[in-house]
């Protein structure tokens, strides 16, 4: 039949950061194409990435409709080319993905320190509230909008002249920490969702140090 030399997709893997979600799979196609379908446990199977020779499919638009739902995808392999014989093909081959719950599993993207401001012996460090592709009322929500108090940030800070790190935590996007007068400090932040069992932490933000352009120093 026409499906004699089609190969089922394998190694179906979800790659997701801040809800930007792509399904990847193997192999690179030879004389075949793929169509992806996605569904919630109770919903319809919706076809996406029709008849593609890519081995990835951006499913962000589907999963952002409800990030707390659990999704399943499947990749169909369709013959396309000079197969060994032509004739009416049976059901196409397909492979299921693992289940994926965006709210619980999307990776937290690397955060960015937006600014820091020193007033005397206090420093206010602000973390950029990154925009996601999740929408509500036609506007894109920030990471904080989506996760609320489930999301915390950990601040690592240290004197430029030493290696001993201190930490602080916040469930907003701002830290207010005590520093020694006359000392320069360096900062790095990490996003954390403590309630998660997987993908709990982001990578650390780039390090920002006092005395560089991002910050503002005011002696009071």
């Amino acid at each position: 039949s026409g499906t004699t030399n089609t190969v089922a997709a394998y190694n179906l893997t979800w790659k997701s950061t801040n809800f930007k979600t792509i399904l990847e799979w193997e192999p690179k196609p030879v004389n075949q194409v793929y169509t992806v379908q996605i569904s919630t446990k109770s919903g319809d199977w919706k076809s996406k990435c029709f008849y593609t020779t890519d081995t990835e499919c951006d499913l962000t638009d589907e999963i952002v409709k409800d990030v707390k739902q659990t999704y399943l995808a499947r990749v169909f392999s369709y013959p396309a080319g000079n197969v060994e014989s032509t004739g009416s093909a049976g059901e196409p081959l397909y492979e299921n993905s693992p289940e994926f719950t965006p709210y619980l599993e999307t990776n937290l993207g690397q955060p960015t320190i937006q600014s820091f401001e020193q007033v005397g012996t206090k420093v206010n460090v602000t973390v950029e509230d990154e925009r996601t592709l999740v929408r509500r009322n036609n506007t894109f929500l920030s990471l904080r909008d989506v996760f609320g108090k489930d999301l915390i940030y950990t601040l690592y800070y240290w004197k430029s002249s030493s290696s001993g790190k201190k930490t602080a935590k916040t469930n907003t996007n701002e830290f207010l920490i005590d520093v020694d007068k006359g000392e320069n400090y360096c900062f790095s932040v990490q996003a954390v969702i403590p309630s998660r069992t997987v993908n709990r932490k982001s990578t650390d933000s780039p390090v920002e140090c006092m005395g560089q352009e991002k910050g503002e120093f005011r002696e009071i």
Epitope: V33, D44, K46, F50, Y51, T53, A80, T86, P92
Partner: antibody, heavy 117, light 106 residues
């Protein structure tokens, strides 16, 4: 048995509005994309676009972006193609066709639209 | 948009003849279908995925090609094969059809 039944022939004047329909039966209507194809008299086929009934997502041929609108009514398993202001160049046969892989191939019988003053 | 150019636009042939219809794409295509349409009827899928015959299509039909050049061949033309044939690409949006090839009786 899968069936797509389209509404009857229409004769309209330029500038008038029109909505033609395609009713699906014998399958889960919301699970399949629905295509619309235009065929002008004595001419070839033109893919206009398609709509996914479950959430009304559309993929539209940019050529028809400002000319025609696709919609659905899930409650009665019906897809629609509509115009707000018809032109003579809209005179054609319009087919709906379920998006399927392979030998599965379901088309409506077509709706003839004639636009003439 | 990918343009599909079919040739010839029409041909006259006799029963038993070998007939070849070509479809040339303006850029590379990985998924090509062919449809048959008879006067006053809706189109029917004839060949899908470049070379796979739809259910009920006789084995005298075949499809081949890759990249930008595709072919539908009828090895021995039969009376019921007189119709118009269209290629269609589904590799990139908007999906497009060729202009059609009308196969007429000589």
């Amino acid at each position: 048995e899968v069936q797509l039944v389209q509404s009857g022939a229409e004769v309209k004047k330029p500038g008038e509005s029109l909505k033609i329909s395609c009713k699906g039966s014998g399958y889960s209507f919301t699970s399949y994309w629905m295509n619309w194809v235009k065929q002008m008299p004595g001419k070839g086929l033109e893919w206009m676009g398609m709509i996914y009934p479950a959430d009304s997502e559309t993929r539209l041929n940019q050529k028809f972006k400002d000319k025609a609108t696709l919609s659905v009514d899930k409650s009665i398993s019906t897809a629609y193609l509509q115009w707000s202001s018809l032109k003579a160049s809209d005179t054609a046969m319009y087919y709906c066709a379920r998006e399927d892989y392979g030998s599965s191939d379901y088309w409506g019988q077509g709706t003839t639209v004639t636009v003439s003053s | 948009d990918i343009q599909l150019t079919q040739s010839p636009s029409s041909l006259s042939a006799s029963v038993g003849d070998r007939v070849t219809i070509t479809c040339s794409a303006s850029s590379s295509v990985s998924y090509m279908n062919w449809y048959q349409q008879k006067p006053g009827k809706s189109p029917k899928i004839w060949i899908y995925g470049i070379s796979n015959l739809a259910s009920g299509v006789p084995s005298r039909f075949s499809g081949s090609g890759s990249g930008t050049d595709f072919t539908l061949t009828i090895s021995s033309l039969q009376p019921e094969d007189f119709a118009t044939y269209y290629c269609q690409q589904k590799s990139s949006f908007p999906w497009t059809f060729g202009g059609g090839t009308k196969v007429e009786i000589k």
